[in-house]
């Protein structure tokens, strides 16, 4: 079956703050109550589970991975945060109602090759871009 | 002061479904109960509010914008979803406990020029990359 995971949906505690532009690197373990920081997680996707078995010949599925976790102040150094994400983290820290925290999303994606039937039932080998998460970050 | 916004944190209703890889374009009005879809929102960031007035000379602030909204099945055609985001949306749709929905994040960012004091109190004009959201999408 398609994937499994444990997810924490907790909101960050956000004591008021006002501050600056690249705190992405401020914490190696940022969340005060040990919520997981933004990172890559395991996910195997079965094409049968998606209902694609009639047109995808191979592979049967693939390791897609996914991104999830906190992008809270102060951000971890490995979070590859953009300048905008750092600013947004600080704005959220000042006033959580103003903006959401940045979100944990793929920063690098890889392709996979898929053998499939096209509309005319020809067998096609095609490389589909941006199918596999290689790295995650705060955006 | 730095920005203001209204945010809906509602979870999507996710009836079971099975579907395919370019379903990103399936709906022009995706959310069944009119939750806002992923899009760019207004946000003005004041450098004083961030506590940066001691080193940033100009500007006093800037229009940063931010991304927020639903990345629920079926995705709107303008959401610039990656293939992985489409797959993740479907996996979430089949079993919401497996993975989160993709998140709404910047797809294009612009730079701004900043006049500031360096370590030696010299006045420097520098272009800071990835400071302004130009477009949002589902990732």
């Amino acid at each position: 079956s398609t994937g499994s995971k444990q997810r924490s949906q907790n909101r960050s505690k956000t004591p008021k703050n006002q501050e600056a532009l690249r705190m992405a690197n401020v914490a190696e373990n940022s969340s005060s109550d040990q919520r997981q920081a933004c990172k890559k997680h395991e996910l195997y996707v079965s094409f049968r589970d998606l209902g694609w078995q009639d047109w995808i010949i191979a592979p049967e599925g693939y390791a897609a991975y996914y991104c999830e976790g906190e992008c809270a102040f102060p951000l971890n150094s490995y979070m590859n945060a953009t300048n905008h994400a750092i600013v947004q983290t600080l704005v959220h820290f000042i006033n959580p109602e103003t903006v959401p925290k940045p979100c944990c999303a793929p920063t690098q994606l890889n392709a996979i090759s898929v053998l499939y039937f096209d509309d005319s039932s020809n067998v096609i080998l095609k490389k589909y871009r941006n199918m596999v998460v290689r790295a995650c970050g705060c955006h | 002061s730095t920005g203001s916004k209204q945010r809906s944190q509602n979870r999507s209703k996710t009836p079971k479904n099975q579907e395919a890889l370019r379903m990103a374009n399936v709906a022009e009005n995706s959310s069944s109960d009119q939750r806002q879809a992923c899009k760019k929102h207004e946000l003005y960031v004041s450098f004083r509010d961030l506590g940066w007035q001691d080193w940033i000379i100009a500007p006093e602030g800037y229009a940063a914008y931010y991304c927020e909204g639903e990345c629920a099945f079926p995705l709107n055609s303008y959401m610039n979803a990656t293939n992985h985001a489409i797959v993740q949306t479907l996996v979430h749709f089949i079993n919401p406990e497996t993975v989160p929905k993709p998140c709404c994040a910047p797809t294009q960012l612009n730079a701004i020029s900043v006049l500031y004091f360096d370590d030696s109190s010299n006045v420097i004009l520098k272009k800071y990359r990835n400071m302004v959201v130009r477009a949002c999408g589902c990732h």
């Epitope: 501050e19 600056a20 690249r22 705190m23 102060p74 | 961030l50 500031y116």
Partner: nanobody, 116 residues
Framework: EVQLVESGGGSVQAGGSLRLSCAAS????????MGWYRQSPGKERELVAA???????NYADFVKGRFTISRDKVNNTVYLEMNTLKPEDTAVYYC??????????WGQGTRVTVSS
């Protein structure tokens, strides 16, 4: 090259207090946050407390109510007041200063040992 120099570590009995200091060797432009981290044997480095240049603070749950972070803007110094110390607070404590647009600055660490 900017250096951060920590001091104030040492050995103390459980329930005791220490005050750590972290001084920058020269002015750093664009500082927006400073933090104290700690690392004990076999564990990852973890955030203890952080402070912004506008003096807003954030604490790890395990030190809330016991530790206080503060800073002296004029002297580029950040402090960590540690009260009611526990044996599990034993670690090497590191100072970090984050400046916009460049790599973070780390101190070399100061050891804190709390005996029961």
């Amino acid at each position: 090259e900017v250096q951060l120099v920590e001091s104030g570590g040492g050995s103390v009995q459980a329930g005791g207090s220490l005050r750590l200091s972290c001084a920058a060797s020269r002015r750093i432009s664009g500082i927006y946050a400073m933090g104290w981290y700690r690392q004990s044997p076999g564990k990852e480095r973890e955030l203890v407390a952080a402070i912004t240049t506008s003096d807003h603070t954030n604490y790890a749950d395990f030190v809330k109510g016991r530790f206080t972070i503060s800073r002296d803007k004029v002297n580029n110094t950040v402090y960590l007041e540690m009260n009611t110390l526990k044996p599990e607070d034993t670690a090497v404590y590191y100072c970090k200063q984050s400046a916009w647009g460049r790599n973070d600055y780390w101190g070399q660490g100061t050891r804190v040992t709390v005996s029961s």
